[in-house]
């Protein structure tokens, strides 16, 4: 055991304590007395840096006194009990409560012992992410928006995507004094390839255990992109019925499909069935250019396909013929 008087009494407290705006917080503060050391505490004091006087005092015979009695309370100190725990509870935290506080013990025979604690006033932000629906513009525009509302300190917003894009982040004061609303726009040149893809907004804040991830499904409005499939350049007389498909990608969805030829209406062997064109068996060679015209809310686009039905050797069974 160390001989009496070799150790010193020490005030123990965290260097920083976080608290939430409007909530209560406890500033912990304890007197650590080494074994064999004798100390008697006669007073506990809390003071704020930069302010004259003390905000809370617990006196061994007078009890507690507070600068703001409704907002402060000694958690454990009691008259007639040993004063070793100076922890102070603060109610209804305000932005202006953030700062440095001193917890002080008046001891005998050691004298005063104190420690400083930084009180950090936080506000947990509310986060939302939404798509910014765009059309093809040919230049960069905001395609997604992520908003972190009422944070203290301001939240950090980053974007994660394999599409590229650039963030544009701004801050404005929040609804509650001392809070900040952060808005981040994700900017890219819109293209049909981007439509339906996801980007992720990552919001980081001291009050979060882990970052919040918000996924945005991108929307690009564009006119139809059209192609015709189903023809393999290998159609012969005697072949069974065949089907061509008008493949259209668009946003919004296509509202109509119209089949025609460069010569005008469809010939009798071609029957339109919405996005599909049924080619019936023919008994003589054909060389026709088919047109599929697709319409959506943004306009109409078309694709052309020249189809040939050729005479082939009778041994082959791939031709178009009547059964």
């Amino acid at each position: 055991w160390p001989p009496p008087g070799t150790g010193d009494v020490v005030v123990q407290a965290p260097t920083q304590v976080p608290g939430f705006l409007g909530d209560s917080v406890t500033l912990p503060c304890y007197l650590q007395v080494p074994n064999m050391e004798v100390t008697h505490v006669s007073q506990l004091t809390w003071a704020r840096h930069g302010e004259s006087g003390s905000m809370a005092v617990f006196h061994q015979t007078q009890g507690p006194s507070y600068s703001e009695s409704k907002r402060l309370e000694f958690v454990a100190a009691r008259l007639g009990a040993e004063l070793r725990n100076a922890s102070l509870r603060m109610f209804g935290l305000r932005v202006e409560d953030e700062g440095n506080y001193t917890c002080l013990f008046v001891t005998f025979p050691q004298g005063s012992r104190s420690v400083d604690i930084w009180l950090r006033v936080l506000a947990k932000p509310q986060n939302t992410a939404e798509v910014q629906k765009v059309q093809l513009t040919g230049e960069p525009v905001p395609m997604a928006r992520c908003v972190s509302t009422g944070g203290r300190p301001p939240a950090q917003i980053t974007w994660h995507s394999d599409l590229g894009g650039m963030p544009n982040t701004s801050q404005v004061p929040g609804f509650l004094s001392g809070t900040v609303t952060v808005t981040s726009l994700w900017i890219l040149v819109p293209s049909s390839q981007v439509d339906g893809k996801n980007v992720t907004c990552k919001v980081e804040h001291e009050s979060f255990e882990k970052p919040q991830l918000l996924t945005v499904n991108l929307t690009v409005y564009y006119p139809p992109e059209v192609s015709i499939s189903g023809y393999d350049n290998n159609w012969y007389l005697g072949q069974n019925e065949a089907t061509l498909t008008c493949d259209a990608r668009s946003n919004p969805e296509p509202t109509g499909y119209n089949w025609s030829t460069t010569m005008g209406p469809l010939p009798p062997f071609a029957v339109a069935q919405g996005a599909q064109l049924l080619i019936r068996p023919v008994d003589k060679p054909i060389n026709t250019t088919l047109i599929c015209n697709v319409t959506n809310a943004l306009g109409a686009r078309q694709a052309e396909l020249t189809v040939q039905v050729k005479e082939g050797p009778p041994s082959e069974h791939s031709g178009i013929s009547r059964n």
């Epitope: 006669s42 006196h59 015979t61 008046v106 025979p109 005063s112």
Partner: antibody
Framework: EVQLQQSGAELVRPGASVKLSCKAL????????MHWVRQTPVHGLEWIGA????????AYNQKFKGKATLTADKSSSTAYMELSILTSEDSAVYYC????????WGQGTTLTVS | DIVMTQSPKFMSTSVGDRVSVTCKAS??????VVWYQQKSGQSPKALIY???YRYSGVPDRFTGSGSGTDFTLTISNVQSEDLAEYFC?????????FGAGTKLELK
């Protein structure tokens, strides 16, 4: 009501010793330290030292180490201060008091060294 | 040792006046300052602890303020029973030290 009853005035010869007493009434004697303070026209109020009757722990002003010895008797709730090798410089009114812990001081003991 | 420099030494006042006594510590003593009143022929009596808190029973015309090194005792609406000597004392570190006193006299 808290009362601190100090022993009567003393007239002593230089070189002698004297033991002053202070009886505490109206509060738990072992709860907090008893301080001793002296007052003279020249030096005003001077802190001599203190004892915590509960633990026996003492603290002294370096100026009075070897001059003053503080003790306490828990059974009678009495604090004592013995002053040794007295000189005329030690002539003063001596007070016992819990200082900032309570409002009260003893009535004082006048010590004359002559 | 911490030196407590008190001023003024003497102060003349009239009943109903407001007076202030100051005390300056030679180093930071936080708010660990007590103010005493000593009437002629009596022992001192504590008025204010921790720089600004009145002991129970002390009239509210006595107000203490300050922290660190500069402290003030203010008596508003001075009464005849307030004519006395006032002392400050620091209890932040040992040895405890007192101011030299301020004597409040009637004009």
């Amino acid at each position: 009501e808290v009362q601190l009853q100090q022993s009567g005035a003393e007239l002593v010869r230089p070189g002698a010793s004297v033991k002053l007493s202070c009886k505490a009434l109206g509060y738990t004697f072992t709860d907090h330290e008893m301080h001793w303070v002296r007052q003279t026209p020249v030096h005003g109020l001077e802190w001599i030292g203190a004892i915590h009757p509960g633990s026996g722990v003492t603290a002294y002003n370096q100026k009075f180490k070897g001059k003053a010895t503080l003790t306490a008797d828990k059974s009678s709730s009495t604090a004592y201060m013995e002053l040794s090798i007295l000189t005329s410089e030690d002539s003063a009114v001596y007070y016992c008091t819990p200082l900032w812990l309570r409002r009260d001081w003893g009535q004082g003991t006048t010590l004359t060294v002559s | 040792d911490i030196v407590m420099t008190q001023s003024p030494k003497f102060m003349s006042t009239s009943v109903g006046d407001r007076v202030s006594v100051t005390c300056k510590a030679s180093q930071n003593v936080a708010t660990n300052v007590v103010w005493y009143q000593q009437k002629s022929g009596q022992s001192p009596k504590a008025l204010i602890y921790s720089a600004s808190y009145r002991y129970s029973g002390v009239p509210d015309r006595f107000t203490g303020s300050g922290s660190g090194t500069d402290f003030t005792l203010t008596i508003s609406n001075v009464q005849s029973e307030d004519l006395a000597e006032y002392f400050c004392q620091q209890y932040n570190s040992y040895p405890l030290t007192f101011g030299a006193g301020t004597k409040l006299e009637l004009k």
